[in-house]
Interface confidence: medium
């Protein structure tokens, strides 16, 4: 088992909103849960966009999930990752 490296980034979206993206990379096996949470509970699927779980060329995999949130509410959102029985939570950078 190779645990993922998780990285959260933010980018400007429409006025008053930002897009936050959570990337998991270099993990094996390929089964992974990656989702955005607000106040600790998962957002609905229709408010998130997922990338495919793809091989990254090193025998491991990568994927991402993104969502759009209101600027100023970043602290309420975290990226939740679960892989091979381990989980971690990652904040939106300031």
């Amino acid at each position: 088992t190779v645990p993922p490296m998780v990285n959260v980034t933010r980018s400007e979206a429409s006025e008053g909103n930002i897009t936050v993206t959570c990337r998991a990379s270099s993990f094996y096996p390929r089964n992974i849960i990656l989702t955005w949470r607000q106040d600790g509970v998962s957002l609905s699927a229709d408010t998130q966009q997922w990338g495919d779980v793809l091989p990254d060329g090193n025998g491991t995999y990568q994927t991402w999930v993104a969502t759009r949130i209101c600027r100023g509410e970043e602290q309420r959102f975290t990226c939740y990752m679960e892989h091979s029985g381990n989980h971690s939570t990652h904040p939106v950078p300031s």
């Epitope: 600790g40 509970v41 609905s44 971690s88």
Partner: antibody, heavy 122, light 112 residues
């Protein structure tokens, strides 16, 4: 389930500040959201704010943003709430409570501390 | 803020009776993820509140099956099928779908 042990009763003067603690044990502290709640004698409960112990991220009830400040010390698995510029309206029991998002996928205040009575009086 | 209104304020019961407690929210409390985070708590005198029901109808661990929750949208009910002495106290409903999270004013269940 684990335990949440709150600090003892406080008698403070108007205008002062008080820092309440909530020491936890028996669960992985950094995985958890901890909320603080207020209950005046004979009244209902008010949610003040939560803090995510893993990151220190917070979300406040706007009513308390100027009054409360939440922090955690992961080395001692303790959550803190500092309450400032106290008035007699702040006399209440304050509870810490742990959310249970993993075990039940959405129970807010699953486990509670015993409460700390704060009395504000000149 | 979402206003949670509980009725009745006081509910006198005889042991063994069924009790029905009502909670109404001032707006729909479906979270943006589709779940309804409506909970019920029991607080006995001098004690911290205890979670009974989460997500409208799910009993929390260790809660007896005489407690059941139901409802949707803005109207919710907690039923106690056969009231026991240990069930006496103040029951609060709570919504965790919209910040700030809010509690109802409580219903006191007491002996008739």
């Amino acid at each position: 389930q684990g335990q949440m042990q709150q600090s003892g009763a406080e008698l403070v003067k108007p205008g002062a500040s008080v820092k309440l603690s909530c020491k936890t044990s028996g669960f992985t502290f950094s995985d958890n959201y901890i909320s603080w709640l207020k209950q005046k004698p004979g009244q209902s409960l008010e949610w003040i704010a939560w803090i995510y112990a893993g990151t220190g991220g917070t979300s406040y009830n706007q009513k308390f943003t100027a009054k409360a400040q939440l922090t955690v010390d992961t080395s001692s698995s303790t959550a803190y709430m500092q309450f400032s510029s106290l008035t007699t309206e702040d006399s209440a029991i304050y509870y810490c409570a742990r959310h249970d998002y993993y075990g039940t996928s959405g129970a807010w205040f699953a486990y509670w501390g015993q409460g700390t009575l704060v009395t504000v009086s000149a | 803020d979402v206003l949670m209104t509980q009725t009745p304020l006081s509910l006198p019961v005889s042991l063994g009776d069924q009790a029905s407690l009502s909670c109404r929210s001032s707006q729909n409390i479906v979270h943006i993820n589709g779940n309804t985070y409506l909970e019920w708590y029991l607080q006995k005198p001098g004690q911290s509140p205890k979670l009974l029901i989460y997500k409208v109808s799910n009993r929390f661990s260790g809660v007896p099956d005489r407690f059941s929750g139901s409802g949707s949208g803005t109207d919710f009910t907690l039923k106690i099928s056969r009231v026991e002495a240990e069930d006496l106290g103040v029951y609060y409903c709570f919504q965790g779908s919209h910040v700030p999270w809010t509690f109802g004013g409580g219903t006191k269940v007491e002996i008739k």
